[in-house]
Amino acid sequence: NIDVCKLGTVTVQPAPVIPLGSAANISCSLNPKQGCSHYPSSNELILLKFVNDVLVENLHGKKVHDHTGHSSTFQVTNLSLGMTLFVCKLNCSNSQKKPPVPVCGVEISVGVAPEPPQNISCVQEGENGTVACSWNSGKVTYLKTNYTLQLSGPNNLTCQKQCFSDNRQNCNRLDLGINLSPDLAESRFIVRVTAINDLGNSSSLPHTFTFLDIVIPLPPWDIRINFLNASGSRGTLQWEDEGQVVLNQLRYQPLNSTSWNMVNATNAKGKYDLRDLRPFTEYEFQISSKLHLSGGSWSNWSESLRTRTPEEEPVGILDIWYMKQDIDYDRQQISLFWKSLNPSEARGKILHYQVTLQEVTKKTTLQNTTRHTSWTRVIPRTGAWTASVSAANSKGASAPTHINIVDLCGTGLLAPHQVSAKSENMDNILVTWQPPKKADSAVREYIVEWRALQPGSITKFPPHWLRIPPDNMSALISENIKPYICYEIRVHALSESQGGCSSIRGDSKHKAPVSGPHITAITEKKERLFISWTHIPFPEQRGCILHYRIYWKERDSTAQPELCEIQYRRSQNSHPISSLQPRVTYVLWMTAVTAAGESPQGNEREFCPQGKAN
C-alpha cells in the first residue's frame, strides 16, 4: 500500500500507458524539506518493480539521471503486456537498520491499439425484439477499450450504444434497444463499430443489412393437433405465429424414429393438414418460420408437441400355430398359439382375441374371447376341424386368420428329408432340409418349430415357430435362442389337409457337459447287465448331448477301460452290456459327449456279475 505520496511524487514519460516494446522514464522527486536528514547527499532513491504484487526487480542500475538527494530518473524497458507497478522508496544510507521508506508509486500499462472490429453480425429476434450486434474485437489490447456500436437507417436516423473491455470483462456484443418494424422491410441499414483506447482507435468497415437479413422470427408457439373424426392417420396441425410469417417448415417423426418427415408450407396461416400419419403412434411435431419466401432466416424450431395418434382397426394377419395331443380314444386337446401383431398392424391396444374352432361337416362351432396369445380346448378326435383367430382393439377387429387342424406328423410321405441344424453364432441356428420325396399333395408351407429341451418345457412354454414359403429350404432361427441350450427343432411340411414332420436337435453354442450321468442301478437279467442312470441336470448339459459312453474295467486293473457308446435319446435311461466276466468285480462309470467334447466321468459303481457271461 502506498501512503498518498506525502514524501514526494513519481511521474512517467511519455505517459503511464505505452505501446508494447516502448521504453519509459520514471522520475521520483522528493518534496521540499523531505528526506533522511539535513544532508541531502545521504538521500538515496530506489525504484522497485512489482508484477501481480510480487517484487520482481530493483531498478538501481537503471538510473539515467540523478539530482543527488532530490530526484532520480530511471529508464524501464522490456515491459510485458498488462499492468506493472513501480514504487519509489527512500533509503537513508547512514541508517542501515531502518528499511527504505515508500515515497510514491505509479502504474504503467502496456498494451496495443485496438484492431478494426470485424465480422459484425446483427440479429433481431422476432418482430418485437431489439437489434443486437456482435463482432470480433481482434487481438486483446490489455487496456480498457471502449467500443461504440452505431446504427444508421433511413431518414438519417441514427442510434449508438457503448461498452468497454478490460481485464475483467469483454465487450463484443451490444443490444441497441431499438426495434425495426416490418414496414422497413425494403430499407437498408448500416452498422459500424468503433474501438478506442489510450493508444489509438479503429473502426470496422460498414456492415450493411436489410430488415429481412437480420430479423429471425420467434419460433411458433401454442402448437396443437386436431384429428379429423378421430382418425389415426389424418390430422390438422395448428400453431400461433408472428404476423409477417409467410413460410413454415414442419417436421414430424414417430418418437422411436431417427429421421424426420419434412414439409414446407407457404401462407399456412397457422394450419396444415397431415395425411400420412401412423395410427396409435407417439409422434413429435416441430415447426419453424420464415418472413420471406427467398430471403431471411428460419426461426429456431418450436418446442416439440408430443402426442399419440388415435387408434384405427387392426390390419394384417395373425400368425397362428397349434399343437395336438390325444387324450384318449375319442378326445384330443388342441392348443392354439398366435403371435402378437406388430404395432403398425395392431394400430391400437389389442383388447382381446376372438377364437373360433369349427368342425367343418357337422357345423359344430366353439367360440371364445381371450386376452392371451394362446387358447386350449378339448374336442372330439373325429371330424375335420378348422381354427380362426382375429385381434380386436377399440376401433374394430382384424380379418380372421384361418388354419386347418391336421395331424401334424401323420403323413410320412410329407416328412422333409435331410434336416440339419448348424450353429451360426451365439444366438441363432441355421436349419436346412430337403422337400418330401413322394408327397401326394403339394406342400403349401413349411413350419419350423423349436422348443428348449428342458423338463416341463412342453407344458410351461409355448412353442416358437417360423412360417416358411414352400420354395425355401432353410430358416435362420433366433427368437429365444440362447447359447449352451439344446433345442428340439421340428420341420413340418403342410399341405391342404395333411402334415408330415422331421425332428432334429440343435444348439447355437456348446461346451463339454459339466458332469456325467449318474448311474443309479446295475441289474443282471438273462446273463446281461442293465445299466440305469439319471440324465445330467439340464443346466449342466451345455448343449445337445450326442451320445453317452459307458466305461468299465476290472477293479484294481491298470489297463485301459472298455467302453460302449450309446446314441443319446431323451426317453432312454438304461442300456444292456454283455461282455463282462462272471464273478469278476468291475468298476463302471458314464460320461456324456456334446459337439464340444466329453464330460468328466459321473459316479463310479462296482458290480460283480454272477451269471454265465457270453
Epitope: Q150, P154, I178, L184, S187
Partner: nanobody, 130 residues
C-alpha cells in the same frame, strides 16, 4: 421510467415567437432521441422536430419541411431539458405541442412516426392568431 413535462405554450400574434421547454426526469440519458410533435384539432399527430445526441458527441437534428428555418430544436443535457424555439409563427402552427422521448421502434416514417416513441408529455397549447 421517464417523466416529461412541457411548458412555454401560449397565445401569440402571427409573426411572433415562442420557446417551448420539456423537462425530463427519471432515468435521464443524453443518448436518446427526443422530439416535438403537434396535433391540431381533427388532425393526426405530426412530427415537428427531433434531436439525437450520441456518445460520440455532435447531434443529429431533424425538421419537418413546414418548419425548417423557422424552428430550432436544442437540448441542455446538464438541465435535462429539451427546447423548441419557434419564430415567424403562422396560424397554421396552432396546435397542442407534445414532447416525446426514446425512439425505440423504427418505422418507415423514421423520427416522424409517433408510434416509435416510448415516453410522452401531457402537451402544451400554442395558439397563433392573425
Amino acid at each position: 421510467q421517464v417523466q416529461l413535462q412541457e411548458s412555454g405554450g401560449g397565445s401569440v400574434q402571427a409573426g411572433g415567437s415562442l420557446r417551448l421547454s420539456c423537462a425530463a426526469s427519471g432515468a435521464t440519458n443524453s443518448n436518446r432521441h427526443m422530439g416535438w410533435f403537434r396535433q391540431a384539432p381533427g388532425k393526426e399527430r405530426e412530427g415537428v422536430a427531433a434531436i439525437y445526441t450520441g456518445y460520440t458527441g455532435g447531434g443529429n437534428t431533424y425538421y419537418a419541411d413546414s418548419v425548417k428555418d423557422r424552428f430550432t430544436i436544442s437540448q441542455d443535457n446538464a438541465k435535462n431539458t429539451l427546447y423548441l424555439q419557434m419564430n415567424s409563427l403562422t396560424p397554421e402552427d396552432t396546435a397542442m405541442y407534445y414532447c416525446a422521448a426514446d425512439l425505440t421502434r423504427w418505422y418507415s416514417g423514421g423520427w416522424r412516426d409517433p408510434r416509435g416513441y416510448k415516453y410522452w408529455g401531457q402537451g402544451t397549447q400554442v395558439t397563433v392568431s392573425s
